[in-house]
Interface confidence: medium
Amino acid sequence: TVVMSEDRPSAPYNVHAETMSSSAILLAWERPLYNSDKVIAYSVHYMKAEGLNNEEYQVVIGNDTTHYIIDDLEPASNYTFYIVAYMPMGASQMSDHVTQNTLEDVPLRPPEISL
């Protein structure tokens, strides 16, 4: 089956990211303006922004939410994110990409200094 481009949802838009901690970033977006009623799920894609050939991760979530916290990230790292809307037999174009960094890891207690 080939899904014609005019039948696909438009891309999710207004994607923005907010740093929550050293391992978590909150992503939020707006539903596609076109054919959003056909969307059954959203797919959040993310990868490290620095370096080459970074692995791309994907998590699929229901169509009943337009935000998601990714909580398995590395500290003090930059990540690039984008969202795709899925309909049963086709997907939207990618949303705009956004880049956001995680916080540095804070040690649980100050280092001991011996004099």
């Epitope: 899904v3 696909r8 797919s43 791309e56 994907q58 699929v60 899925y86 086709g90 997907a91 174009q93």
Partner: nanobody, 121 residues
């Protein structure tokens, strides 16, 4: 030949539970992002949840408390366990592979034929 075959549907009492199976052939379940999707009579498709290659699961928030997705790699089979069933859960349940978007935006991917679950006393 790539195939997904669901089983385990049928008539279930309200408040009961179900366990659906989805046997895959022609590809490896554990190296794909696999999903369960359902369609109630006269309604659109509803994504239930999925399990990725590393075994991490994710569920539609409204169903999260009642649903568990798992797999048996040795049997190349995906499972859906659903508890506290109600009449609104009556639907045809499908397993599916939603491909990474990098595979391209026009695709005909792998869907099973579906199994009907009727919740009624």
């Amino acid at each position: 030949e790539v195939q997904l075959v669901e089983s385990g549907g049928g008539l279930v009492q309200p408040g009961g539970s179900l366990r659906l199976s989805c046997k895959a052939s022609g590809f490896t379940v554990s190296s794909n992002y696999m999903h369960w999707v359902r369609q109630a009579p006269g309604k659109g498709l509803e994504w239930i949840g999925g399990i990725n290659h590393s075994g991490r699961t994710n569920y539609k928030s409204s169903l999260k408390s009642r649903v568990t997705i798992s797999r048996d790699n040795s049997k190349n089979t995906l499972y859906l366990q659903m508890n506290s069933l109600r009449a609104e859960d009556t639907a045809v349940y499908y397993c599916a592979r939603l491909p990474p978007s990098r595979d391209g935006y026009n695709y005909a991917d792998y869907w099973g034929q579906g199994t009907l679950v009727t919740v009624s006393s």
